[in-house]
């Protein structure tokens, strides 16, 4: 065998992000010469799950009839030929919104801002959560995180955006999590819609203020600006 | 040491169904899948299907896929094997066995330990 | 399915004998090729997986060799309590499945 087999690639239709008791569909693509499919979950010890391939032998399926917290979680696969397992494949996360109950989202000091100006978007849960996700409908990247410092549960979390240019205009939601797993969400808030109105030649932000612009606005994720003094919260990444 | 403990024989009328039960220790039952196969009269084996005891997931032969449910229970480390429809071919015996990866070397698995098996016999 | 044909049905040899028994594979099924004991009393024990790959506490006498669709299980020094039926099973695709089976008796 001349080097290692190479790994193959992982996805879920209709997508990674999945209510509970919808149906989803993980997805291992490798080469025509697999024998089998190893479908692998983080921390579990046994193979999660194994298939035959589906002709012509290139790929297999592994099918959730009914999202559960159960199924979340971190996913690799592997797959076999005659010579032997491939590289694992890069991760897939798979999460679950409608684990608790809806946070609401709401734009300060309005959801209709001129360009330039400053706004905030708060997200606020009934029940204290220690992360919360601001998502923006079409988003390439859409998760922002903003995580609680030493697990201090919080009711909200600020996203504040300064200066405000045309392309923060949008939809966005916002979801509520626990430490504990991020694999597993609240429902959704409700679409907030953020107009932007003013010139329509904003200048472009500085990537260290508020939009990384590397490589187009809708295509790096939407990052907050300043501190985030009331919420005990920290930016965080995954 | 591993064991794997089956239910006692079985006498069961034409159309109807059975469940044997295998009860495992000495391993961590969560670790490893459960596999099923039978043994008819005089006859070799044949595979009914496996189960993975820590997500409920399950394989089967294509000829037993309408007719057996695999299922587990990891607070008491027992596995099922439940046929329905029984006609008098289903009688024989059926073993549990331990699936799990032999070896250092990732790749390797086979099933490494069976139970004494459970004769069912279907007769009017 | 893959069909795996064994040979012999049954053989008789003396303690000490060397005993071959051959297991043939309908397509190839890359070593993936394991051999099991049962002894008359039902009881199934691992030999030998991945071809040629001792199960811990298998006394040495057993062995295994082959690839592609043709696989060899050899005991080099038959021994009484080696009386049982030897199957082999192949583990390359779902469903596995098993050979016929050899009955291995004492002269």
């Known amino acids: 065998q001349a080097g290692p087999l190479p790994k193959p690639t992982l996805w879920a239709e209709p997508g990674s992000v999945i209510s509970w008791g919808n149906s989803v569909t993980i997805w291992c693509q490798g080469t025509l010469e697999a024998r089998e499919y190893r479908l692998d979950k983080e921390e579990s010890p046994a193979p999660w799950d194994r298939q035959n391939p589906l002709e012509p032998k290139n790929k297999a399926r592994f099918s959730i009839p009914s999202m559960t917290e159960d199924y979340a979680g971190r996913y690799r696969c592997y797959y076999r030929s005659p010579v032997g397992w491939s590289q694992p494949s890069d991760p897939l996360e798979l999460v679950m919104t409608g684990a608790y109950s809806k946070p609401t989202l709401s734009a300060l000091p309005s959801p209709l801002v001129t360009s330039g100006k400053s706004v905030t978007l708060l997200c606020q849960s009934r029940s204290p959560m220690d992360t919360f996700l601001l998502i923006k409908e079409r988003a390439a990247h859409p998760l922002l995180h903003l995580r609680s410092e030493h697990g201090a549960q919080q009711h909200q979390a600020e996203f504040p955006m300064s200066p405000v240019t045309s392309v923060h205009g949008g939809t966005y939601r916002c979801f509520s999590s626990h430490g504990f797993s991020h694999y597993l969400l609240s429902h959704p808030s409700d679409p907030l819609e953020l107009i932007v109105s003013g010139s329509l030649e904003d200048p472009r932000p500085s990537p260290t203020r508020s939009v990384s612009t590397a490589a187009g606005p809708e295509d790096q994720p939407l990052m907050p600006t300043g501190s985030v003094p009331h919420s005990g919260l920290r930016r965080h990444w995954e | 040491q591993v064991q794997l403990v089956q239910s006692g024989a079985e006498v069961k009328k034409p159309g109807a169904s059975v469940k044997v039960s295998c009860k495992a220790s000495g391993y961590t039952f969560t670790n490893y899948w459960m596999h099923w196969v039978r043994q008819a009269p005089g006859q070799g084996l044949e595979w009914i299907g496996e189960i993975n005891p820590s997500n409920g997931r399950t394989n089967y032969n294509e000829k037993f896929k309408t007719r057996a449910t695999l299922t587990v229970d990891t607070s008491t480390s027992t596995a099922y094997m439940e046929l329905s429809s029984l006609r008098s071919e289903d009688t024989a015996v059926y073993y549990c066995?331990?699936?799990?990866?032999?070896?250092?070397?990732?790749?390797?698995?086979?099933?490494?330990?069976w139970g004494q098996g459970t004769l069912v016999t279907v007769s009017s | 399915d893959i069909v795996m044909t064994q040979s012999p049905s049954s053989l008789s040899a003396s303690v000490g004998d060397r005993v071959t028994i051959t297991c043939r594979a309908s397509q190839d099924i890359s070593n993936y090729l394991n051999w099991y004991q049962q002894k008359p009393g039902g009881a199934v024990k691992l030999l030998i997986y991945y071809t040629s790959r001792l199960h811990s506490g298998v006394p040495s006498r057993f062995s295994g060799s082959g690839s592609g669709t043709d696989y060899t299980f050899t005991i080099s020094s038959l021994q009484p309590e080696d009386i049982a039926t030897y199957f082999c099973?192949?583990?390359?695709?779902?469903?596995?499945?098993f050979g016929g089976g050899t009955k291995v008796e004492i002269k």
């Open positions: 066995a331990r699936w799990g990866q032999l070896g250092l070397r990732e790749g390797y698995y086979a099933v490494d330990y």
């Open positions: 099973q192949q583990g390359n695709t779902l469903p596995p499945t």
